[in-house]
Amino acid sequence: GSSPRSGVLLRGCPTHCHCEPDGRMLLRVDCSDLGLSELPSNLSVFTSYLDLSMNNISQLLPNPLPSLRFLEELRLAGNALTYIPKGAFTGLYSLKVLMLQNNQLRHVPTEALQNLRSLQSLRLDANHISYVPPSCFSGLH
């Protein structure tokens, strides 16, 4: 097996998820609507797309997706997230699309979004956010 590092593998498809390689030799991983309460283990470092929407994920630990430097789209819509800690998206250098709608967030996860230099699309609708500070997206380009 692989080095035991936070459930990341060189190759592999998480149990019950659907995985399909794309035209760039990277992996699209669909783990949506599986009743998951936490992020799946055995994610390939070569994952470019990860759909975790419509699950029951209530919290993210800091740095839950280490070394996923090819990840371009992360879908976490329709979960039970109330808070996203600083460092939750550390190392996601290529992340362009982040879907966080339909959760239970009360604040814009400003610190977690810092340094997502590639981010182009962010969805936070259908949460419990009542106030958006004027500088909360200042770390984005």
Partner: antibody, heavy 116, light 107 residues
């Protein structure tokens, strides 16, 4: 131009050790994994070991686990395969290959012969 | 480990022939399959990846298809430089595994 150049092969006695090197150039070393794949004389291809340098992730075939160690030096863009407790069945041409999900470029190979 | 079984193990064909090689995985591997060409004394070369994507620089006479457990490599019109051994390989899980090879010889 992508280049992978293996070195370090040769004749070694059973139980002996060898260290293979794979010098990479022409691509971003930290954007790929490096694998070693071997081919015994007249036989097919067998994956041996792999490393993803940014995270230090490694993986091994069961046939070499505990005997072979893969490593990489990102400052030199070079991967290594330390082979200990060599057996006659380890005799093969050893190729290094760069990969994401698939092995898209291979070196020319280096021959390892284990014989007394 | 996932077993990859190729057929035939060898075939004889003429220049201009259409050649088909099949590969069967012992379990579902989605489309995580590649095909390689190897000539004697040389390193393998990637032809097809993700079951059906033609690798850069590979002639369009090569094509791949399949999903799940059954995969095919087709050479639409065999050329003299195509006489070689062809391997399929799965990357769905670790360890990545290869088929035993199909040798394409001149008839």
């Amino acid at each position: 131009e992508v280049q992978l150049v293996e070195s370090g092969g040769g004749l070694v006695q059973p139980g002996g050790s060898l260290r293979l090197s794979c010098a990479a150039s022409g691509f971003t070393f930290t954007s790929y994994s490096i694998s070693w794949v071997r081919q015994a004389p007249g036989k097919g291809l067998e994956w041996v070991a792999e490393i993803y340098p940014p995270g230090g992730y490694t993986d091994y075939a069961d046939s070499v686990k505990g005997r072979f160690t893969i490593s990489a030096d990102t400052s030199k863009n070079t991967a290594y395969l330390q082979m200990n407790s060599l057996r006659a069945e380890d005799t093969a041409v050893y190729y290094c290959a760069k990969a994401r999900l698939f092995f898209d470029y291979w070196g020319q190979g280096t021959l390892v012969t284990v014989s007394s | 480990d996932i077993q990859m079984t190729q057929s035939p193990s060898s075939l004889s064909a003429s220049v201009g022939d259409r050649v088909t090689i099949t590969c069967r995985a012992s379990q579902d591997v989605s489309t995580a399959v590649a095909w390689y060409q190897q000539k004697p004394g040389k390193a393998p070369k990637l032809l097809i990846y993700s079951a059906s994507f033609l690798y850069s620089g590979v002639p369009s006479r090569f094509s791949g298809s399949g999903s799940g457990t059954d995969f095919t490599l087709t050479i639409s019109s065999l050329q003299p430089e195509d006489f070689a051994t062809y391997y399929c390989q799965q990357s769905y899980t670790t360890p990545p595994t290869f088929g035993q090879g199909t040798k394409v010889e001149i008839k």
